[in-house]
């Protein structure tokens, strides 16, 4: 039994982690600077998307890049419980805190702000430079989706790395996982064409959920051959005249649930991966 | 002046490097196994490409993946001159060999076979599983293109890493370079739409040349809406009916030079990067 409550321990761990973050700002500032620069570069490359076939390609391309970038950037989250492993074991044995206090304290002070920031920065820079769908809900859905991708990818990193002593193996494993997840995200292969004995793998792909949600959010209601007389039979000359046609070809459900089910899936993954990470820390404590 | 000729030294360095490679086969065998597994996985995912709009997406996707995979796999080439840096300086000072003998010896025995193998394996597995263009010339052009991409990416790795003492910085720099090169390769963004003040960057992108060559080789002459009822008005429903239409939309020159200029560019990059790597080794020797 502990003399201090869970909440007190949680506050204490969070405070210390946050102080460490502010006391060593180089890493955080560097991450922000890199995110801003990358956001501006992406914004410049894709500046002012057209509403034609190149507009379809460029929209899909930038959304894919943002999704996969969020995943690969999250590989750095493997360090969260690895670098402080010895300190955690020492302090836990000494009765400083519960495993749960340490776990949630680190998440709240470190993971939450450091994974939220890139999503906000990317969305704010890229959205307006590219001229994505000009509605407030679409803007915030994109921001929320990128956050969810970052959190689920980071959670997976924690689940793989928690309790390990070296970062390199976890990093390699994460990278391999994300490469396969990237293939199944829906840009490099049309998911409707994959053989049934393999297609189930798409449901384990974090970027697939993020990319699908971002596409649903951006393409729905878009017109990619504007100016054509819609009454004339020949409007059929364009393979993909509407965002709906494009989404249907990609096998994406057009209903609102077709959007939100991706966030539900990512939320489930976050819960599952964080549970695994927590159990690994508990398991670690038993063998310490 | 040296008592032994350049050729004798070259043979000696090559022989030793090759013996090291065979004496420690785990790395080589592991690379071959990983390549075979990845080839089979890619073959299974994209098995039997269709001749419709999904066929266009899947062809472009797999060719993009193979190109970028060749690039990122070549990052490991940074080790070639780094891990033996001290040994090289010691042996060079002791008058064992010329810099040129060591340089070309290492290239011939280590870089040449280890970068050629994945290209051959990938092509042999993927080509027939996917059902790419069934002509011998197209098969060998794909193999040659993947080799050229691997060699130019590896040459870039050598140019960055030669003379350095630690692998990590060079690896990070290579990865960042390849991420930007990947954006400019032509799948994630339609290169015809990039602003002129930025579009020149595409000419420094290794995967862009590889991806363009692979697409030219595969798409030319392909029919992506075959067998449509020729009298029905809706036959025009397909935006991209031929490989030529697709290539033109991507800004790819349809002439034979449109294919071979990519290999010429890659060859020029190989020469430039290897020259830089060689000069860095020469420069290193002066300061040893």
């Amino acid at each position: 039994s502990y003399t201090t409550s869970f909440c007190h321990q949680l506050r204490w761990v969070s405070k210390r982690s946050f102080k460490n973050l502010l006391g060593n700002p180089q890493a955080s500032i560097a991450q922000i600077i890199v995110t801003v620069i990358l956001g501006l570069v992406i914004g410049a490359i894709y500046f002012g998307l057209n509403n034609d076939s190149t507009g379809i390609q460029n929209r899909a391309g930038v959304l894919f890049f943002l999704t996969t970038n969020q995943c690969f950037s999250s590989v750095s989250a493997v360090e969260l419980f690895v670098v402080e492993k010895k300190l955690f074991i020492h302090e836990y044995i000494s009765g400083y805190y519960r495993v749960s206090s340490y776990f949630f304290g680190k998440l709240l002070s470190d993971l939450l702000p450091m994974r939220m920031l890139p999503s906000i920065i990317f969305t704010c820079i890229v959205y307006f430079m590219l001229g994505l769908k000009p509605t407030a809900d679409a803007f915030f859905i994109m921001m929320f989706t990128l956050m969810m991708v970052a959190y689920s990818a980071s959670s997976m990193a924690l689940a793989i790395a928690a309790g390990q002593s070296v970062v390199s193996v976890a990093t390699l494993l994460m990278t391999i996982c994300f490469v396969f997840m990237m293939i199944f995200s829906g840009l490099l292969v049309n998911l409707t064409t994959i053989a049934s004995w393999l297609s189930w793998l798409q449901y384990f792909s974090i970027p697939r959920y993020g990319f699908t949600a971002l596409q649903h959010n951006e393409f729905l209601g878009q017109n990619f051959c504007p100016g054509l007389n819609a009454t004339v039979n020949n409007t059929c000359n364009y393979a993909t005249c509407t965002g709906e046609e494009y989404l249907t070809k990609q096998g994406i459900d057009l209903s609102p649930w077709g959007l939100w089910k991706n966030h539900v899936a990512l939320a489930c993954m976050i819960v599952i991966f964080l549970t695994i990470a927590y159990l690994k820390l508990l398991f670690l404590k038993k063998y310490s | 002046s040296y008592t032994t000729s350049f050729c004798h030294q070259l043979r000696w360095v090559s022989k030793r490097s090759f013996k090291n490679l065979l004496g420690n086969p785990q790395a080589s065998i592991a690379q071959i196994i990983v390549t075979v597994i990845l080839g089979l996985v890619i073959g299974a995912i994209y098995f039997g490409l269709n001749n419709d709009s999904t066929g266009i997406q899947n062809r472009a996707g797999v060719l993009f993946f193979l190109t970028t995979n060749q690039c990122f796999s070549s990052v490991s080439a940074v080790e070639l001159f780094v891990v033996e840096k001290k040994l090289f300086i010691h042996e060079y000072i002791s008058g064992y060999y010329r810099v040129s003998s060591y340089f070309f010896g290492k290239l011939l025995s280590d870089l040449l076979p280890m970068r050629m193998l994945p290209s051959i394996i990938f092509t042999c597995i993927v080509y027939f599983m996917l059902g790419l263009k069934p002509t011998a010339d197209a098969f060998f052009i794909m193999m040659f293109t993947l080799m050229m991409v691997a060699y130019s990416a590896s040459s870039m790795a050598l140019a960055i890493a030669a003379g350095q003492s630690v692998v990590s910085v060079a690896t990070l720099l290579m990865t960042i370079c390849f991420v930007f090169m990947m954006i400019f390769s032509g799948l994630l963004v339609n290169l015809t739409t990039i602003a002129s003040w930025l579009s020149w960057l595409q000419y420094f992108s290794i995967p862009r040349y590889g991806f363009t060559a692979l697409q030219h080789n595969e798409f030319l002459g392909q029919n992506f809406c075959p067998g449509l009822n020729a009298t029905v008005n809706n036959t025009c429903n397909y935006a991209t009916c031929t490989g030529e239409e697709y290539l033109t939309k991507q800004g790819i020159d349809l002439s034979p030079w449109g294919l071979w200029k990519n290999h010429v560019a890659l060859a020029c990059m190989i020469v430039i990067f290897l020259t830089i790597a060689y000069l860095k080794l020469l420069f290193l020797k002066k300061y040893s």
Partner: antibody, heavy 118, light 106 residues
Framework: EVQLVESGPGLVKPSQSLSLTCSVT?????????WTWIRKFPGNKMEWMGY???????NYNPSLRSRISITRDTSKNQFFLQLNSVTTEDTATYYC???????????WGQGTLVTVSS | DVVMTQSPSLLSASVGDRVTLSCKAG??????LAWYQQKLGKAPKLLIY???SLQTGIPSRFSGSGSGTDFTLTISSLQPEDVATYFC????????FGSGTKLEIK
């Protein structure tokens, strides 16, 4: 009903340019499809030459790419074939047709015989 | 280019006969094959596409079959108006035509 009619000189001198016109009625060439030229040589061999699509995109047979040009006049609903540096080997009956891409040709003109001779 | 070889180059048959014309492709063309009929001084007329799909307005006595590289056009009961030259066309990779089979009545 779509109708295609070829017109142009029946005799062309070697090294000169062959120019043919295809007039389309019953369908607007900018509305859809690819408007194609095909030729049939005296020995019955048939060759696809190239097309101009509804969007203005042109696609040519690689063996002819250096000397062929297909253009259109949308106001007159016509498309044209120009073949440069002709030889006696270019003697054939030239047809204009409508399809999409390389697909089967359901609509043909009646054909026009062009002889290349000095 | 995919070379298309038609045989025979000349075929004589009697009215009412079942006639088969052959077309061989230089490589697999995924059943993307069409047949045309061309009468003297006329434009070719599309009979069959996708190996076995009958074009609208074409009599049902014409049928197509085959797969891979070997294809046939069959006229179940030859009629006098079927005298013509028949061409095959592949449209799998670019488009190429056979050299034709001239069909005449004995």
């Amino acid at each position: 009903e779509v109708q295609l009619v070829e017109s142009g000189p029946g005799l062309v001198k070697p090294s000169q340019s062959l120019s043919l016109t295809c007039s389309v009625t019953g369908y607007t060439i900018t509305s859809g499809y690819d408007w194609t030229w095909i030729r049939k040589f005296p020995g019955n061999k048939m060759e696809w030459m190239g097309y101009i699509s509804y969007s203005g995109f042109t696609n040519y047979n690689p063996s002819l790419r250096s000397r062929i040009s297909i253009t259109r006049d949308t106001s007159k609903n016509q498309f044209f074939l120009q073949l440069n540096s002709v030889t006696t080997e270019d003697t054939a009956t030239y047809y204009c047709t409508r399809t999409r891409g390389y697909n089967p040709f359901a609509y043909w003109g009646q054909g026009t015989l062009v002889t290349v001779s000095s | 280019d995919v070379v298309m070889t038609q045989s025979p180059s000349l075929l004589s048959a009697s009215v009412g006969d079942r006639v088969t014309l052959s077309c061989k492709a230089g490589r697999n063309i995924n059943n993307y094959l069409a047949w045309y009929q061309q009468k003297l001084g006329k434009a070719p007329k599309l009979l069959i596409y996708n190996t076995n799909s009958l074009q609208t307005g074409i009599p049902s006595r014409f049928s197509g079959s085959g797969s891979g590289t070997d294809f046939t056009l069959t006229i179940s009961s030859l009629q006098p108006e079927d005298v013509a030259t028949y061409f095959c066309q592949q449209y799998n990779s670019w488009t190429t035509f056979g050299s034709g089979t001239k069909l005449e009545i004995k």
